[in-house]
Amino acid sequence: GIAIPRNSGCPNSEDKNFPRTVMVNLNIHNRNTSTNPKRSSDYYNRSTSPWNLHRNEDPERYPSVIWEAKCRHLGCVKADGNVDYHMNSVPIQQEILVLRREPRHCPNSFRLEKILVSVGCTCVTPIVHHVA
Amino acid sequence: GIAIPRNSGCPNSEDKNFPRTVMVNLNIHNRNTSTNPKRSSDYYNRSTSPWNLHRNEDPERYPSVIWEAKCRHLGCVKADGNVDYHMNSVPIQQEILVLRREPRHCPNSFRLEKILVSVGCTCVTPIVHHVA
């Protein structure tokens, strides 16, 4: 880890296992004010590897709703709308952090959890040609 | 929000604005044990909309390192390796939660923050604007 200089204005920690348990302000600061979230919203339909978005809901998790991408086809879509058997649609996955209520149902106590989510799909060549 | 039944075994909260500030255990639980992270690691090179991964580091953030995808081409790559400019490589973006040290440099006090990251790229048909 990186050594962080201790600021005298920091809240005290009474946790013996400091900093395993920390205080987190849930008032979310959104850094994306300049980004138009609508911008990429139609890529799922216009992609050569289109996908559907499925709602995954879990009240014991924060955020409770996560959208999972599922590729519509095994192959990719050609310009004429038909499948290209020589190419594959595959999910692009990312590990994200979520907060899991622990103990269960507790409104103010969480544990960090890493989960793998599919964000969208991309079109790949199935075979890597190795050149001698 | 969803009403969560209070469990008698929950830690007490002394925060008057409860549950704006919560306790979070940073001992990460990884739900992805069955997933091999190597599996999708070569998609960035084999995609028709290939991308490069750039390291974004910030010691005031948790996780401190985030990888950002940047599409290599404006167009998409054809089977012969040339770029098709009738199609567009575009980043697939996702909003993720990170922890931001607040006040700055404090090791045990954070605020939740939403940031937009590019996870990979996909190949899309461009929107054609028809002029009347």
Epitope: H73, L74, G75, K78, D80, G81, N82, V83, D84, Y85, H86, N88, V90, P126, I127, V128 | R39
Partner: antibody, heavy 120, light 107 residues
């Protein structure tokens, strides 16, 4: 009930032609990918050709490319395989098979098969 | 083409035994694997797709596992009606290819 019934098999001389048909019933034929898969006597399974739901995409392995043609008539719920320039090694039971999706990747229903024998 | 190497080519086991068949692909097939059962004189029947997903109506004693190039098909408790030849099939890269088959017999 899903049913696939192949017909058109028989004995043919090397260099000859045959046209196989597969009549489909019990499902909306026009929304499923279809394939022909063959099995030489006492041997394993081999893909012969694939066609997507509307006939817009097809695939042939090198062993039959240029000799065999897959097609479909969605109005008649029928799949076809036109086989030309037949060789002894084409002798097999030919199955038509349905993909559970649009395209033809794996096969959830198969016909009973029709035997093609190429011999002089 | 991707080669699918299935083993063993045949096996003999007792009713109630656990039976395991393996299928090795010549390169990563990213879980795009199906398993079929073929009884003598009959057409193949799909049991598993996506390496692990059991088809509707297929008994739970059948299961699939694996990733990358190595996949396994298991019958947890062999039944007399399981006498058949089992095939794996990859659908990652055209042409889709099948394993050579495993003939399962009862001791």
């Amino acid at each position: 009930e899903v049913q696939l019934v192949e017909s058109g098999g028989g004995l043919v001389q090397p260099g000859g032609s045959l046209r196989l048909s597969c009549a489909a019933s019990g499902f909306t034929f026009s929304t499923y990918g279809m394939s022909w898969v063959r099995q030489a006597p006492g041997k394993g399974l081999e893909l012969v050709s694939i066609i997507n739901h509307n006939g817009g995409s097809t695939f042939y392995p090198d062993s039959v490319k240029g000799r065999f043609t897959i097609s479909r008539d969605n109005s008649k719920n029928t799949l076809y395989l036109q086989m030309n320039s037949l060789r002894a090694e084409d002798t097999a039971v030919y199955y038509c098979a349905r993909d559970p999706r649009h395209d033809g990747y794996f096969f959830d229903y198969w016909g009973q098969g029709t035997l093609v024998t190429v011999s002089s | 083409d991707i080669q699918m190497t299935q083993s063993p080519s045949s096996l003999s086991a007792s009713v109630g035994d656990r039976v395991t068949i393996t299928c090795q692909a010549s390169e990563d097939i990213y879980d795009r694997l199906a398993w079929y059962q073929q009884k003598p004189g009959k057409a193949p029947k799909l049991l598993i797709s996506g390496a692990t997903s059991l088809e509707t109506g297929v008994p739970s004693r059948f299961s699939g596992s694996g990733s990358g190039t190595d996949y396994t098909f298991t019958i947890s408790s062999l039944q007399p009606e399981d006498i058949a030849t089992y095939y794996c099939q990859q659908y990652w890269s055209v042409p889709w290819t099948f394993g050579g088959g495993t003939k399962v017999e009862i001791k």
